[in-house]
């Protein structure tokens, strides 16, 4: 048993049929030592008397709020939550599995820039009764301060039958230097409780691997005098880390109709233009990526081959 | 040589061009690595990420661009020295910073040279002859630091009279062929930004 | 199977004009770029120019420009390439090549010899 | 025109050993970037795309790698069916243009 916060215990439990659970001693936070009795959540059923109680915590009905009166009047809370551990692996059951960029994959995190800033979130089909606490670092055996946010919920989706909740977070490292060469990753931690279950995830990266830039803006297009080409050009995102030529990026230029089967012109820049062949009802798309460290592609910014 | 900074053609900015193919030689490097050590720990999440040059040269600091100087967190370990010669350097006016940024960039490159070339007598002596270091990239090494052109004390190759661990020896490659991609990347973009300056 | 299906060799006489079909077959021929290169005996490949057979829309190579002429007519799935003015240094192989990305060639025909010879 | 240069232009090699051919470009063509391997009497055959992707059914000892002006084809260990001609092509710019060709004879 371990303290999440204050007045709230974690019980790591191992999970399987009649497994024997694990016997907690709670202990009444007050000065006095007589006429104390102990209740479970709304109920009224005394469990016991004395400053401290022992339970044998096996399953989720021994979890919940327990606490001490004297004489009608609350002294104390201890809240109890349970981690499951089934075959020696703590379980996963609040978040989804993104499976992206492997199985397991319950934290995303992507970055825009160098600076030291990046959002995680993750997914989840619980709507209610739902708690996130998020705390990150750099490194873990002398841990270098990042700052999180508090986790809100950022989208609501319909997948099939059930709907879909996506969380996120905002985080910052507290004193991080865009050049810098990182040696130790970024560890994310978010305690997930949901009633009365407690789970952990987390997630280890390099900001430059989880670098994903904005797409490119100001997209622009001038037909060339006699030709089928056209000449496209376009800006750095704003909020790509500066200066631009030192944090440089490389573009991929696409003309494509609305099919992602249909025929396309394709073509690779280190500059922010580009002469492509146009097509009737297609699209001219620009999209960014890290020039020299490839980490994702930012997504397509687009304007209408006409 | 002496060519001058201020110009967008690479053919002009030799060192560019070099660093280019530098980034292009480990990278390529680093997946044959991989592909060829699958059963050993050798991806970013595997390996411990060290830093043959920690405390030896100062590359981030002293090539930092002059726009991320105010950035307080950039500036912890800025130091100073007094080589100024080579040819990547625009003219005798070229900034102290830009000098001590070069032989600092330099002075890496032949750490590793003698780390990599280290590291391959041991891998040849592997009866497994599993995995050599790409002859490409040393002689990429090798180009850079002649563009660049610095006078320095030559550092004698290691010589071990041990038996190598070759299991050890691989995981050692991995870890070198990560750092030094991870410098080859700030190596590219400090002479992408000397080249637009 | 996606297959191009070149027409038989020619023989020319310099001055005069050739044209050379290419019939694809397997997947909707509207869908693929269209394009022409050459290669003259124990030479390198040298591109000519693409049709998108959607809509007739063409490009050639500038040394090709106004000798060169390609069409295509969706009801055949069939590209032609005509060349005019031919002179021996003309003598090649012609290769029709289609994908659906503009700038490079994942089909090929088998090849056309012309030999444009007096 | 962006002028493709190969070299070797003829490259010996035995059987089971590997094989690189190098092609630069006249002016920076990011990773725009095709080889093609052609037989005689054969058309080509397209076996890397931009630079370094490979094309389903082209054996994995084909490799590309390169972007900007330099790069490099690199088969990992010859079989007797990979002796063939061998063009690079740029798509940076219209006029498409190829290089001369590498001709890998058996050593």
């Known amino acids: 048993i371990w303290e999440l916060k204050k007045d709230v215990y974690v019980v790591e439990l191992d999970w399987y049929p009649d497994a024997p659970g694990e016997m907690v001693v709670l202990t009444c936070d007050t000065p006095e030592e007589d006429g104390i009795t102990w209740t479970l959540d709304q109920s009224s059923e005394v469990l016991g008397s004395g400053k401290t109680l022992t339970i044998q915590v096996k399953e989720f009905g021994d979890a919940g709020q327990y606490t001490c009166h004297k004489g009608g009047e609350v002294l104390s809370h201890s809240l109890l939550l349970l981690h499951k551990k089934e075959d020696g692996i703590w379980s996963t059951d609040i978040l989804k599995d993104q499976k992206e960029p492997k199985n397991k994959t319950f934290l995303r995190c992507e970055a825009k820039n160098y600076s030291g800033r990046f959002t995680c979130w993750w997914l989840t089909t619980i709507s209610t009764d739902l708690t996130f606490s998020v705390k990150s670092s750099r490194g873990s055996s002398d841990p270098q301060g990042v700052t999180c946010g508090a986790a809100t919920l950022s989208a609501e989706r319909v997948r099939g039958d059930n709907k879909e909740y996506e969380y996120s977070v905002e985080c910052q490292e507290d004193s991080a230097c865009p050049a810098a060469e990182e040696s130790l990753p970024i560890e994310v931690m978010v305690d997930a409780v949901h009633k009365l279950k407690y789970e952990n995830y987390t997630s280890s990266f390099f900001i430059r691997d989880i670098i994903k830039p904005d797409p490119p803006k100001n997209l622009q297009l001038k037909p060339l005098k006699n030709s089928r080409q056209v000449e496209v050009s376009w800006e750095y995102p704003d909020t790509w880390s500066t200066p631009h030529s030192y944090f440089s990026l490389t573009f991929c230029v696409q003309v494509q109709g609305k099919s992602k089967r249909e025929k396309k012109d394709r073509v690779f820049t280190d500059k922010t233009s580009a002469t492509v062949i146009c097509r009737k009802n297609a699209s001219i798309s620009v999209r960014a990526q890290d020039r020299y460290y490839s980490s994702s592609w930012s997504e397509w910014a687009s304007v209408p081959c006409s | 040589r002496n060519l001058p900074v201020a110009t967008p053609d690479p053919g002009m900015f030799p060192c560019l061009h070099h660093s280019q193919n530098l980034l292009r030689a480990v990278s390529n490097m680093l997946q044959k690595a991989r592909q060829t050590l699958e059963f050993y720990p050798c991806t970013s999440e595997e390996i411990d990420h060290e830093d043959i040059t920690k405390d030896k040269t100062s590359t981030v600091e002293a090539c930092l661009p002059l726009e991320l100087t105010k950035n307080e967190s950039c500036l912890n370990s800025r130091e100073t020295s007094f080589i100024t010669n080579g040819s990547c350097l625009a003219s005798r006016k070229t900034s102290f910073m830009m000098a001590l940024c070069l032989s600092s960039i330099y002075e890496d490159l032949k750490m590793y040279q003698v780390e990599f070339k280290t590291m391959n007598a041991k891998l040849l002596m592997d009866p497994k002859r599993q995995i050599f270091l790409d002859q490409n990239m040393l002689a990429v090494i090798d180009e850079l630091m002649q563009a660049l052109n610095f006078n320095s004390e030559t550092v004698p190759q290691k010589s071990s009279l041990e038996e190598p661990d070759f299991y050890k020896t691989k995981i050692k490659l991995c870890i070198l062929l990560h750092a030094f991609r991870i410098r080859a990347v700030t190596i590219d973009r400090v002479m992408s930004y000397l080249n637009a300056s | 199977q996606v297959q191009l299906v070149q027409s038989g060799a020619e023989v020319k006489k310099p001055g005069s004009s050739v044209k050379v079909s290419c019939k694809a077959s397997?997947?909707?021929?509207?869908?693929?770029?269209l394009h022409w290169s050459r290669q003259a005996p124990g030479q390198g490949l040298e591109w000519m120019g693409w049709?998108?057979?959607?809509?007739?829309?063409?490009e050639y190579a500038p040394k090709f420009q106004g000798r060169v002429t390609i069409t295509a007519d969706e009801s055949t799935s069939t590209a032609y390439m005509e060349l005019s003015s031919l002179r021996s240094e003309d003598t090649a192989v012609y290769y029709c090549a289609r994908n659906k990305e503009l700038r490079y060639f994942d089909v090929w025909g088998q090849g056309t010899l012309v030999t444009v010879s007096s | 025109d962006i002028v493709m240069t190969q070299s070797p232009l003829s490259l010996p090699v035995t059987p089971g050993e590997p094989a690189s051919i190098s092609c630069r470009a006249s002016q920076s063509i990011s990773i725009n970037l095709h080889w093609y391997q052609q037989k005689p009497g054969q058309a080509p055959r397209l076996l890397i795309y931009f630079a370094s992707q490979s094309i389903s059914g082209v054996p994995s000892r084909f490799s590309g790698s390169g972007s900007g002006t330099d790069f490099t084809l690199t088969i990992s260990s010859l079989q007797p069916e990979d002796f063939a001609t061998y063009y690079c092509q740029q798509s940076n710019s219209f006029p498409l243009t190829f290089g001369q060709g590498t001709k890998v004879e058996i050593k």
């Open positions: 049709i998108d057979p959607e809509n007739g829309d063409t």
């Open positions: 397997g997947g909707t021929f509207s869908d693929y770029y």
